[in-house]
């Protein structure tokens, strides 16, 4: 009986530690995509609807804020698309990029952690164009550091929750 009690206590401890593990999955807020044809910061994301969830991290002012030191896996998926029903592309040569940036408040600095993308030729003769970028990596993050996303040509973003999103989850503590 004692062994059973110990076992269930261990399970509970494991479970509560897992539940305390920080994670976030943020999806694009399609009603508030900024305009611009150069690099712009995406500041409007959902954290609590549809696929979007957050736990033991903070989302504020368009940035994902780390609350616990640790090693985190960061990821971002950005889809760009254009259909002729929305009009024409003013230029057919496009640079479609995503930048995942870390900002430190304590020592004011900003670093690009990951970038991805390509130059594309989207011919006006085609009815539909689509391009997807996925980046991911393992990073040491400190409490208070902020993660943000920048993209080029935001007017071409696919606004669906399964298309444009980013997130993070803690993998382990810093020894």
């Amino acid at each position: 009986e004692k062994a059973m009690v110990d076992g269930s206590w261990l399970d509970l401890a494991k479970r509560s530690k897992l539940e305390a593990q920080p994670f976030a999955h943020l999806t694009i807020n399609a009603t508030d995509i900024p305009s611009g044809s150069h690099k712009v910061s995406l500041s409007s994301w959902y954290h609590d609807r549809g696929w979007a969830k957050i736990s033991n991290m903070t989302f504020s002012n368009g940035k994902l804020i780390v609350n616990q030191d640790g090693f985190y896996y960061l990821y971002a998926n950005i889809c760009f698309r254009h259909h002729e029903t929305s009009g024409d592309l003013a230029t057919e040569y496009l640079q479609l990029m995503v930048y995942v940036t870390k900002t430190s408040i304590k020592i004011p600095s900003s670093h690009t952690l990951m970038k991805g993308g390509s130059t594309k030729y989207w011919s006006g003769n085609s009815e539909f164009h689509f391009y997807s970028i996925n980046v991911g990596g393992f990073f040491k993050l400190r409490s208070g550091e902020e993660i943000s996303i920048e993209v080029s040509n935001p007017s071409l973003l696919d606004p669906d929750q399964d298309a444009t999103y980013f997130g993070a989850f803690k993998v382990r503590d810093i020894d």
Epitope: S35, S37, G87, D88, N153
Partner: antibody, heavy 126, light 103 residues
């Protein structure tokens, strides 16, 4: 305020060419596209083509491909549409119109024509 | 190529009447539909863009609705200055126009 002022009426013989100008004022000419639209007597409005005033890129209706040239002079904030090999069916009022999309804010030419020129009547007759 | 079809081609109504013009696209165009007013000898005027957004400076008696392939322009209370031909438009395609007259 935003204004598009077009050149005056023209009469041409079949086979000739005509060049219509469209002078813009009241906004940054280079940040917008200019479209050309015409209306023949008793017909619907007909889109002909556009020019991105910033980079000079153009797109034309298949119907006019090979007969139409659209250019711009950014210093003079003026767009030009030249139509060649004129025939009697080209008799129409030709309009320039500004696309509402600001190219600084995005790269989609949206085909919302928020300001129009007063129109230029081109008559093709022998 | 998308074809826009308007109905009716002409209509006659009294001042103060509610007037409705319909525009159909040959395939779905989401909400990318605009309405213009054209008076003889004058520059066309954008009334409604994006199916239902009222262009700045346009009287509130004009309204637009619809999505997909069917759209309507409504004048809630027809005024003498509304005598004109109205065109729907999606990118490169215009409807054939609806001529509005006063009875």
């Amino acid at each position: 305020q935003v204004q598009l002022v077009q050149s005056g009426a023209e009469v041409r013989k079949p086979g000739a060419s005509v060049k219509v100008s469209c002078k813009a004022s009241g906004y940054d000419f280079s940040n917008y596209a200019i479209h050309w639209v015409r209306q023949a007597p008793g017909q619907r409005l007909e889109w002909m083509g556009w020019i991105n005033a910033g980079n000079g890129n153009t797109k034309f209706s298949q119907k006019f491909q090979g007969r139409i040239t659209v250019t711009r002079d950014t210093a003079a904030s003026t767009a030009y549409m030249e139509l060649r090999s004129l025939r009697s069916e080209d008799t129409a009022v030709y309009y320039c119109a500004r696309d509402t999309s600001n190219m600084v804010r995005g790269i989609i030419i949206a085909y919302y024509f928020d300001y129009w020129g007063q129109g230029t009547l081109v008559t093709v007759s022998s | 190529e998308i074809v826009m079809t308007q109905s009716p081609s002409s209509l006659s109504a009294s001042v103060g009447d509610r007037v409705t013009i319909t525009c159909r696209a040959s395939q779905s165009i989401s909400r990318y539909l605009n309405w213009y007013q054209l008076k003889p000898g004058k520059a066309p005027r954008l009334l409604i863009y994006g199916a239902s957004s009222l262009q700045s400076g346009v009287p509130s008696r004009f309204s637009g609705s619809g999505s997909g392939a069917e759209f309507t322009l409504t004048i809630s209370s027809l005024q003498p200055e509304d005598i004109a031909t109205y065109y729907c438009q999606h990118t490169r395609a215009f409807g054939q126009g609806t001529k509005v007259e006063i009875k």
